[in-house]
Amino acid sequence: DGCKDIFMKNEILSASQPFAFNCTFPPITSGEVSVTWYKNSSKIPVSKIIQSRIHQDETWILFLPMEWGDSGVYQCVIKGRDSCHRIHVNLTVFEKHWCDTSIGGLPNLSDEYKQILHLGKDDSLTCHLHFPKSCVLGPIKWYKDCNEIKGERFTVLETRLLVSNVSAEDRGNYACQAILTHSGKQYEVLNGITVSITERAGYGGSVPKIIYPKNHSIEVQLGTTLIVDCNVTDTKDNTNLRCWRVNNTLVDDYYDESKRIREGVETHVSFREHNLYTVNITFLEVKMEDYGLPFMCHAGVSTAYIILQLPAPDFRAY
């Protein structure tokens, strides 16, 4: 069919709750493309009817909720004007009753469900909730060993649980819970997280390293489209946020009206000792006001910027 297979992603998921997967592969999906989801090599696309339990929502496939029989390989086809790429997503659904100790341990869960706290440090756990814009998430509640977490050492901040002065007793089974509202219906999302405690700082210390950009300028013509990647290495267990800012504001917020400059969806590659993260910034059309402004990539406490500048005039043209 002329489509190039990009990669296979494996996801292990809990039944009876919502799940969403976004078909994104920068820079392919940053241009004018159409995205279509298929199940198990079916020739007919996944429905876009929002009442359908499994449906496509923009570039996402959304399960409301996931059921045991949904296990299988799903294909996402990304078609551009002159290109076709395909991503395979292998979903394995398991029945998990988080508070039922009689049921055996979890299968090999992804790193999102295995997190590490550093002994004696102030640290945090992240509740990974990836859903399309049509899904509204309520406030997150945190549980440890099935009891809601309370106490001065714990603070809930957006999707994170801040833990001050981590102790050995903080290891164990955690869960974060949120109510998701979609098209007027409510669903419970409950993510289990197995937390271990470590004393070592890990790969290269706990400060993320921005590989690119390197506080430099980029020559770019007025009116052109520009995509710049921010590449970051960080520990596998990190809870740092990575984002692009301008004038100390998230670019998506700063350009909320025009959407002319947008932050891409973060991707990462897992290595033995660390992760390499990529999050891009897209200028749909470079304007005069963009020149000379530092566009900052933030990764935890680390920052690096790019500054756009007009190319020097080419006098050979005269």
């Epitope: 020739k43 429905s47 009817i49 929002i50 009442q51 359908s52 007027g184």
Partner: antibody, heavy 116, light 107 residues
Amino acid sequence: EVQLLESGGGLVQPGGSLRLSCAASGFTFSDYDMSWVRQAPGKGLEWVSAIEGAGSDTYYADSVKGRFTISRDNSKNTLYLQMNSLRAEDTAVYYCARLAPEFDYWGQGTLVTVSS
Amino acid sequence: DIQMTQSPSSLSASVGDRVTITCRASQSISSYVNWYQQKPGKAPKLLIYQNDKRPSGVPSRFSGSGSGTDFTLTISSLQPEDFATYYCQPSFYFPYAFGQGTKVEIK
């Protein structure tokens, strides 16, 4: 060019039945969810029913549930609406529309009049 | 179910005028609104989808914006062929609901 052409409308008595058809062309029919939307004389648009590309799942507005049945024949590129137990308030122009998920293409409509 | 309320229900304007139509949802829909144009005796036509995207062939004088509960369709400079009824509809909400319509008439 995407084209949707409805047929089957007409005058029917209350309690009667009618079957509407919508012939589609210019796109891969089975790749798209399809829908019926109606418009009573001088009134606004009202969604009636929708069906998934494979035809396996169907959805209805409360006002027609149990009386109307949506179906499709992907080999014939045709969408259907079987309307039973028709009432005076079902009088409307019925449009078939492609669902993507916005209603991106519409037929010209077929008028259904329910009157004794 | 969600209710979409359009205002005004009708308006009179002249060629060249800037026209704004508002659509208010009965609850926050957090997602997108589509806009349709319908001329008398004709089928509706998709004008704006996902808040601010125009299908090919729709002139740039039509634009959409908004979020939460309030959404707007703007015609920057009204043309003779724009006199019609306009409907809003939330994209990711079920059952599919349309606003009651806004009729744009010649002053």
